[in-house]
Amino acid sequence: LQDPCSNCPAGTFCDNNRNQICSPCPPNSFSSAGGQRTCDICRQCKGVFRTRKECSSTSNAECDCTPGFHCLGAGCSMCEQDCKQGQELTKKGCKDCCFGTFNDQKRGICRPWTNCSLDGKSVLVNGTKERDVVCGPSPADLSPGASSVTPPAPAREPGHSPQ
């Protein structure tokens, strides 16, 4: 015998209190698949969370973070504070990168500058808290008569057009 609940589409639930009739999900709940015996509670995007997509009877709400914070975790389950470039987030808040490290984003940790000498290259542009060093040609390439080297253009963040 076929389970009568299997006929209940997404957006409804199989109501045991009403002879297994397919009842619509009540407000603030959803079912994303058919044959459900209960509807799931909609996620609430409140406080630091903002609603990116409203809950419907067939799909959960989706959240993102209020300005100054960014999403962490699956489905933006947490919002972490942004820091400035040249900083990292610690348990005590945003702290400047230590000398010899950099962070070119508003999130994540400070990373060590590239060690140019490991690749047999020289430092063309010194590193800062916000930017990695730029490695130039190897010292041998800088001997008299070697062709001049054009330094690479500074990296741009994705999504930003040149000024």
Epitope: R43, Q44, V48, F69, S77, G93
Partner: antibody, heavy 121, light 110 residues
């Protein structure tokens, strides 16, 4: 089992600053809202404000100019400061956990036992 | 003055069913789920109902909640003497960006 414990002076003089700390034990302070709620004698509950673990704050508009809530995740503590207090700030102050944002549904689900603060000279 | 409105008192006899109402506005109850709390004298409130009609584990099914429009209600069936307490409704208020509470209803079991 997460437990919350308020601490701070039970008597504050008018015009001074009320300072309370809530210590969270048995669980992490991360990924929740941490809330201060007060209850004047014989009256109902009033939200003072809340802080998200990563530093976002929101305060009751009627208290906003006087209140600061801060958090120290390394100590699993969050704190309330209420400036320029008057007798109207006399209340039981509860700290509480709120998991209403993110993937949480319950709202304010774990409460401290409450601490009585009297404003009097 | 509380943002949500509850009757200050309610009463019933053991075994009876009582309901407590809570009314708000479109920025709170009208747009967000309702929670109910129970507070015994000298203790912290305890979550009784969340998200309009959901019971946390350990809360007996004698307690039920419902919501319609900008109003909500808590029903207690099979009233018992230990149900004598203060009951508060709460909802998130979008304009205040935080929780708002009712003034509380003192339930007396006669």
């Amino acid at each position: 089992q997460v437990q919350l414990q308020e601490s701070g002076p039970g008597l504050v003089k008018p015009s001074e600053t009320l300072s309370l700390t809530c210590t969270v034990s048995g669980g992490s302070i991360s990924s929740y809202y941490w809330t201060w709620i007060r209850q004047p004698p014989g009256k109902g509950l009033e939200l003072v404000g809340y802080i998200y673990y990563s530093g976002y704050t929101s305060y009751n508009p009627s208290l906003k100019s006087r209140v600061t809530i801060s958090i120290d995740t390394s100590k699993n503590q969050f704190s309330l400061q209420l400036n320029s207090v008057t007798a109207a700030d006399t209340a039981v102050y509860f700290c509480a956990r709120d998991d209403y944002g993110g993937n949480g549904y319950y709202g304010v689900d774990v409460w401290g036992q409450g601490t009585t603060v009297t404003v009097s000279s | 003055q509380s943002v949500l409105t509850q009757p200050p008192s309610a009463s019933g006899t053991p075994g009876q069913r009582v309901t407590i109402s809570c009314s708000g506005s479109s920025s709170n109850i009208g747009n967000n789920p309702v929670n109910w709390y129970r507070q015994l004298p000298g203790t912290a409130p305890k979550l009784l109902i969340y998200s309009n009609n959901q019971r946390p584990s350990g809360v007996p099914d004698r307690f039920s909640g419902s919501k319609s429009g900008t109003s909500a209600s808590l029903a207690i069936s099979g009233l018992q003497s230990e149900d004598e307490a203060d009951y508060y409704c709460a909802a998130w208020d979008d304009s205040l960006n935080g929780w708002v509470f009712g003034g509380g209803t003192k339930l007396t079991v006669l």
